[in-house]
């Protein structure tokens, strides 16, 4: 059973996800974005269900893709290198769900831009915190 | 349905230059991310680099760094890899390759490859 | 840089036969890997992407799977055209890595 040190500390890493992604939509949604268009084309793909940590195998596997849009952004729209910001939610992911079960993603049918894809792990992030508190 | 064309077998002196042609059709070169990537003689394949030709922006593979110049002309969909300073270790047969992200997830990797053009750099 | 181990370097099989290849990562890649084959005088061609995805236009008999860092491509009934020399590649960050591959021969 989890004990109440390490429920603290996946919430507190959950945050630190939540507000990696934030800032992430925030610096896409900025209004000087000039590269916001073609990040719009960018496909993403959903999962088919996200209730369980394990299920971050999903956004983990998307992690590439979006390093890769956020290259197009102007660097000043975040405060790391997208290098080093994917590298860092890298490391929590791999932290929240694990390195030894190997859960392969479902994905659902239909894609989503770079900021539907966000929106949807925000979602997933601030309802397992919720769960936690 | 894409296909990468490339330019032709190309014989070099050591410390020459060689610049190989890779043209896409059945789609815009601005879909995709160009790789290239070589397998000497007998041996395994090696990343080199890549550029995204909507903005030209490119990475390279630390081996190749200050060797290697990856272009593209979007105008006639054509993606190019320059190699200098030759030396017969160069010799090899260089693939251009693709990945893009508005496609499905399969198209992600490595999916169309060009036919591969042999350099070979001899004295 | 990531360096993929592909073992064994060679492996003598019959047609009919099932045929099992390694790649082990040498750090965590999460499903970043794909295989690829490809024949002499001939380019690579994609056939399990993202780990255990089968890519279009490739027969069922080819899967892949993967436990932790270690990747697995199995051909479970071997056809002719299937001799050929396969390789892994890791997608999870640059520079993209290959095996040094492996070479599937008629026994």
């Known amino acids: 059973a989890p004990t109440s040190s390490s429920t603290k500390k996946t919430q507190l890493q959950l945050e630190h996800l939540l507000l990696d992604l934030q800032m992430i939509l925030n610096g896409i949604n900025n209004y000087k974005n000039p590269k916001l268009t073609r990040m719009l084309t960018f496909k993403f793909y959903m999962p088919k269900k996200a209730t369980e940590l394990k299920h971050l195998q999903c956004l983990e596997e998307e992690l590439g893709p979006l390093e890769e849009v956020l290259n197009l952004a102007q660097s000043k729209n975040f405060h790391l290198r997208p290098r080093d910001l994917i590298s860092n939610i890298r490391v929590i992911v791999l932290e929240l769900k694990g390195s030894e079960t190997t859960f392969m993603c479902e994905y659902a049918d239909e894609t989503a831009t770079i900021v539907e894809f966000l929106n949807r792990w925000i979602t997933f992030c601030q309802s397992i915190i919720s769960t936690l508190t | 349905q894409v296909q990468l064309v490339q330019s032709g077998a190309e014989v070099k002196k050591p410390g020459a230059t060689v610049k190989i042609s890779c043209k896409v059709s059945g789609d815009t070169i601005t879909a995709y991310y160009m790789h290239w990537v070589r397998q000497a003689p007998g041996q395994g394949l090696e990343w080199i680099g890549r550029i995204d030709p909507d903005d030209d922006s490119t990475k390279y593979a630390e081996n190749f760094k200050g060797r290697v110049t990856i272009t593209a002309d979007t105008s006639t969909d054509t993606a190019y890899m320059e190699l200098s300073s030759l030396r017969s270790e160069d010799t090899a047969v260089y693939y251009c390759?693709?990945?893009?992200?508005?496609?499905?997830?399969?198209?992600?990797?490595?999916?169309?490859w060009g036919q591969g053009t042999l350099v070979t750099v001899s004295s | 840089d990531i360096v993929l181990t592909q073992s064994p370097a060679t492996l003598s099989l019959s047609p009919g036969e099932r045929a099992t290849l390694s790649c082990q990562a040498s750090q965590y890649i999460s499903n970043y890997l794909s295989w690829y084959q490809q024949k002499p005088g001939q380019a690579p061609r994609l056939l399990i992407y993202?780990?255990?995805s089968l890519a279009s236009g490739i027969p069922a008999r080819f899967s892949g799977s993967r436990s932790g860092t270690d990747f697995t491509l199995t051909i479970s009934s071997l056809e002719p055209e299937d001799f050929a020399v396969y390789y892994c590649l890791q997608h999870y960050s640059t520079p993209y890595t290959f095996g040094q591959g492996t070479k599937l021969e008629i026994k």
């Open positions: 390759t693709t990945i893009t992200f508005y496609y499905t997830r399969e198209l992600r990797w490595f999916a169309y």
């Open positions: 993202s780990a255990t």
